[in-house]
């Protein structure tokens, strides 16, 4: 069984969160994909999404969020630049597939942004203030307004956890061991 994991990223203000969500290439390559924040007890809120149909390796920028969908690699890259303390929270990637519910991707990201400069051993201090140069062709896509009712039937786990789940069905009831992920810049 595949595990739905929640990975914790501890970053400083001004740094960049740079993550990827993988998906089944054959099924979802051109589907519209979105980056959502999940606040306890609330419906997931879509912050940015790719175009529909999603274009291959074509950056879409919504504010400080940049999405890049690599169809040929089955990967959605998500960057949140110039992080602020208020960006802290739980995030997820989903694939829109109307009229069906959005398909949630692995992994969920627990982002913790703190004030001050990172001096963490192993972190790349040279690139903590990276300013990403995005091509001028960057597009802002319109995101669907609907959200899956299933994803709000219960609040997400508050700890960084591995959750056992059969293949693509998501079950957030069995919280197991805590995973702590080192700082990434």
């Amino acid at each position: 069984a595949t595990k739905l994991t929640e990975e914790k990223y501890e970053l400083k203000e001004g740094q960049t969160l740079d993550v990827k969500c993988d998906y089944t290439l054959e099924k979802f390559a051109s589907s519209q994909k979105a980056w959502q924040i999940i606040r306890d007890g609330e419906m997931p809120k879509t912050l940015a999404c790719t175009e529909r149909p999603s274009k291959n390796s074509h950056p879409v920028q919504v504010g400080r969020i940049i999405l890049e969908d690599y169809h040929d690699h089955g990967l959605l890259r998500v960057r949140m630049v110039n992080l602020q303390v208020e960006d802290s929270g739980l995030y997820q990637c989903v694939i829109y597939q109307p009229p069906k519910e959005p398909h949630m991707l692995f992994d969920r990201i627990r982002l913790v942004v703190t004030k001050g400069f990172s001096g963490t051993p192993g972190s790349n201090e040279n690139s903590t203030q990276n300013v990403y140069k995005i091509p001028p062709t960057t597009t802002k896509a319109l995101c669907p307004l609907y959200t899956s009712p299933r994803t709000v039937t219960q609040a997400p786990p508050k700890s960084t956890a591995d959750v056992s789940t059969p293949d693509s069905e998501i079950n957030l009831t069995n919280v197991t061991d805590i995973i702590r992920v080192p700082v990434f810049n």
Partner: antibody, heavy 122, light 107 residues
Framework: QVQLVQSGAEVKKPGASVKVSCKAS????????INWVRQATGQGLEWMGW????????GQTQKFRGRVTMTRDTSINTAYMELSSLRSEDTAVYYC???????????????WGRGTLVTVSS | DIQMTQSPSSLSASVGDRVTITCQAS??????LNWYQQKPGKAPKLLIY???NLETGVPSSFSGSGSGTDFTFTISSLQPEDIATYFC?????????FGGGTKVEIK
């Protein structure tokens, strides 16, 4: 001991397929991507694609699309790379390499298998 | 695809010499650059990630610098055990691409 152990050398005829295995030990197999990189004799390194051992999802470069299949068996912490329709130009050493955490855009390879030499000859 | 051009393709230097290898990307790679060492008959070994970060256990005689499209790898004092081929690799965009390699030999 943290390591990736690959299967032994193979000699194949043109048109045949080869399946190379890569067994991980000493770390949580499902937490890190497995990548496949090949190197023809005396040549440079060529990235073929990646596998997320947790989800089972994979991606390949355009060059290998339709010819390469990457799979895993999490019960034995092993990744596989199968290359079909072999031709003489596929003669190379095939490496598996551990990438970053499955969710991180961190494509550096800090752990490598010793490589599997695949010779394609009629 | 992003092209990574390494130079020189080979070099010969004396023990104790400072050795410099350059890697040029065909476009800005936002500091997503790694360096590997490969000894004959062996698998590559990660030395430096993200331009200048030394991998655990790698001697401080190795260093990396640069930004944008131009990057440099330096061995401050060449030792006999440094005889190898060195490769740069970018990961700003997929597909991941490597430089052609620089073979370092002892005079």
């Amino acid at each position: 001991q943290v390591q990736l152990v690959q299967s032994g050398a193979e000699v194949k005829k043109p048109g045949a397929s080869v399946k190379v295995s890569c067994k991980a030990s000493g770390y949580t197999f499902t937490r890190y991507d497995i990548n496949w990189v090949r190197q023809a004799t005396g040549q440079g390194l060529e990235w073929m694609g990646w596998l997320n051992p947790n989800s089972g999802n994979t991606g390949q470069t355009q060059k290998f699309r339709g010819r390469v299949t990457m799979t895993r068996d999490t019960s034995i912490n092993t990744a596989y790379m199968e290359l079909s329709s072999l031709r003489s130009e596929d003669t190379a050493v095939y490496y598996c390499a551990r990438g970053g955490y499955t969710s991180a855009w961190r494509w550096y390879f800090d752990l490598w298998g010793r490589g599997t030499l695949v010779t394609v000859s009629s | 695809d992003i092209q990574m051009t390494q130079s020189p393709s080979s070099l010969s230097a004396s023990v104790g010499d400072r050795v410099t290898i350059t890697c040029q990307a065909s476009q800005d790679i936002n500091n997503h650059l790694n360096w590997y060492q490969q000894k004959p008959g062996k698998a590559p070994k990660l030395l430096i990630y993200d331009v200048s970060n030394l991998e655990t256990g790698v001697p401080s005689s190795f260093s990396g610098s640069g930004s944008g499209t131009d990057f440099t790898f330096t061995i401050s004092s060449l030792q006999p055990e440094d005889i190898a081929t060195y490769f740069c690799q970018q990961y700003d965009k997929l597909p991941l691409t490597f430089g052609g390699g620089t073979k370092v030999e002892i005079k």
